[in-house]
């Protein structure tokens, strides 16, 4: 969490941002909130990016003002116009690119004063893994697949029964470049699996950590997946 305060002149206002991560090719949100004003026409929101000449986005007098918008953001940004009045200056970003990573500034002017806060935005690719029993294999084998990751993640297997065991000798992980030549498909195979056990396939890079669990018993197979973004710090 980054909390910024105003500059000289008028009173300062508190602006709060949250560091976040964008999944390339998907839509993202850069979070920013501020002390609200009672009049929408008095609020100015400017989003800036370090190293970019033009603005990322500007909202003033109750509407977007995109005359100074940098070409790289054309047609890709929007604020939640109906939520500006309650202090939400968050930015919706379409079709996140690797090059969108960097330091952004959320700069606010209201009748109460001015304020700004920086936000670190990471970009990469992350997806939920799915673990299945590989019935084509000669021995009991599990196959963990996740369609989109970048940068290349690490893959670690774990089991409930053999806690702390190292499965690197009995697993094989491969990374296959996807058609857009940036993200990769992750496939990891675990051999010599025993029944009545829960196995976890953990995929992690510097942006996200995802886990796919599978419980194999005589009578059923239960699966569960979850994904967590790393370093979501507020400022």
């Amino acid at each position: 969490l980054i909390i910024g305060f105003g500059i000289s002149g008028r009173h300062s206002i508190t602006v709060t941002t949250v560091a976040s991560a964008g999944n390339i090719g998907e839509d993202g949100i850069l979070s920013c909130t501020f002390e609200p004003d009672i009049k929408l026409s008095d609020i100015v929101i400017q989003w800036l990016k370090e190293g970019v000449l033009g603005l990322v986005h500007e909202f003033k007098e109750g509407k977007d003002e995109l005359s100074e918008q940098d070409e790289m953001f054309r047609g890709r940004t929007a604020v939640f116009a109906d939520q500006v009045i309650v202090g939400n200056a968050s930015l919706r970003l379409k079709n996140v690119q690797l090059t969108d990573a960097g330091t952004y500034k959320c700069y606010i002017i209201t009748s109460k004063g001015k304020g700004n806060a920086n936000l670190e935005y990471k970009t990469g690719a992350f997806s939920m893994p799915e673990v299945n029993v590989d019935y084509n294999a000669s021995s009991e084998t599990l196959r963990c697949e996740a369609p989109r990751w970048f940068p290349q993640p690490t893959v670690v297997w774990a089991s409930q029964v053999d806690q702390g065991a190292n499965f690197s000798e009995v697993s094989n992980t491969s990374f296959e470049l996807n058609s857009e030549n940036v993200t990769m498909k992750v496939v990891s195979v675990l051999y010599n699996v025993t029944i009545n056990n829960t196995y976890s396939c953990m995929i992690e890079n510097d942006i996200a950590k995802a886990t796919g669990d599978i419980k194999v018993t005589e009578s059923e197979i239960k699966r569960r997946s979850h994904l967590q973004l790393l370093n979501s710090k507020a400022s």
């Epitope: 995109l66 047609g75 890709r76 940004t77 116009a81 079709n95």
Partner: antibody, heavy 120, light 107 residues
Framework: QLQLQESGPGLVKPSETLSLTCTVS??????????WGWIRQPPGKGLEWIGN???????YYNPSLKSRVTMSVDTSKNQFSLKLSSVTAADTAVYYC????????????WGQGTLVTVSS | EIVMTQSPATLSVSPGERATLSCRAS??????LAWYQQKPGQAPRLLIY???ARVTGIPARFSGSGSGTEFTLTISSLQSEDFAVYYC?????????FGGGTKVEIK
């Protein structure tokens, strides 16, 4: 409510320049949250996005037409224009102007369209 | 450029029946997709944006769904005024592209 109206010659000779103007009424072309776009539709076929312009004059064109397209805006007249050079019979189409959301980038409303035929 | 493919090209439906129109993108467009209705001699009319958000004034019988590469426009109970051509449009990346259209005709 906002209305758009295309105007311009309905017949253009091959190799010449097609020129159309879109007049916006019931609202200002300076609406900051919108671009102003051109879309065309050859007879009996689908829709093709030509490009857009912001009231400040910044433009973005479809790469397939970029070398031949020029768009301009006249805020004093609440109008924006399209020029397409070196036309051929393949450019025969109904040409629509439309308001384009800055994001989400929908088109609404549209002009009623004007048929431009390229023929000698 | 992202290629949008609509199916079927023609859909024959009786009034009061349900119509399901499909739109497929050549690569993921997230939910950056709009649907339009076009009647003969008229300009297209926006129905749905962001894949599922219905435009103000559009009847509730029109609904959109999907994300990524597969999208659907559903007309729950076709009225006589709904017989038209429907287009999908992606605005995920430039250049914006439209599908070839689905003609919904009276059976």
């Amino acid at each position: 409510q906002l209305q758009l109206q295309e105007s311009g010659p309905g017949l253009v000779k091959p190799s010449e320049t097609l020129s159309l103007t879109c007049t916006v009424s019931g609202g200002s072309i300076k609406s900051g949250s919108h671009y102003w776009g051109w879309i065309r539709q050859p007879p009996g076929k689908g829709l093709e996005w030509i490009g857009n312009i912001y009231y400040s004059g910044s433009t973005y064109y479809n790469p397939s037409l970029k070398s031949r397209v020029t768009m301009s805006v006249d805020t004093s007249k609440n109008q924006f224009s399209l020029k397409l050079s070196s036309v051929t019979a393949a450019d025969t189409a109904v040409y629509y102007c439309a308001r384009e959301g800055s994001y989400p980038n929908w088109f609404d409303p549209w002009g009623q369209g004007t048929l431009v035929t390229v023929s000698s | 450029e992202i290629v949008m493919t609509q199916s079927p090209a023609t859909l024959s439906v009786s009034p009061g029946e349900r119509a399901t129109l499909s739109c497929r993108a050549s690569q993921s467009v997230s939910t950056n997709l709009a649907w339009y209705q076009q009647k003969p001699g008229q300009a297209p009319r926006l129905l749905i944006y962001d894949a599922s958000a219905r435009v103000t004034g559009i009847p509730a019988r029109f609904s959109g769904s999907g994300s990524g590469t597969e999208f659907t426009l559903t007309i729950s109970s076709l009225q006589s005024e709904d017989f038209a051509v429907y287009y999908c449009q992606q605005y995920h990346s430039f250049p914006f592209t439209f599908g070839g259209g689905t003609k919904v005709e009276i059976k």
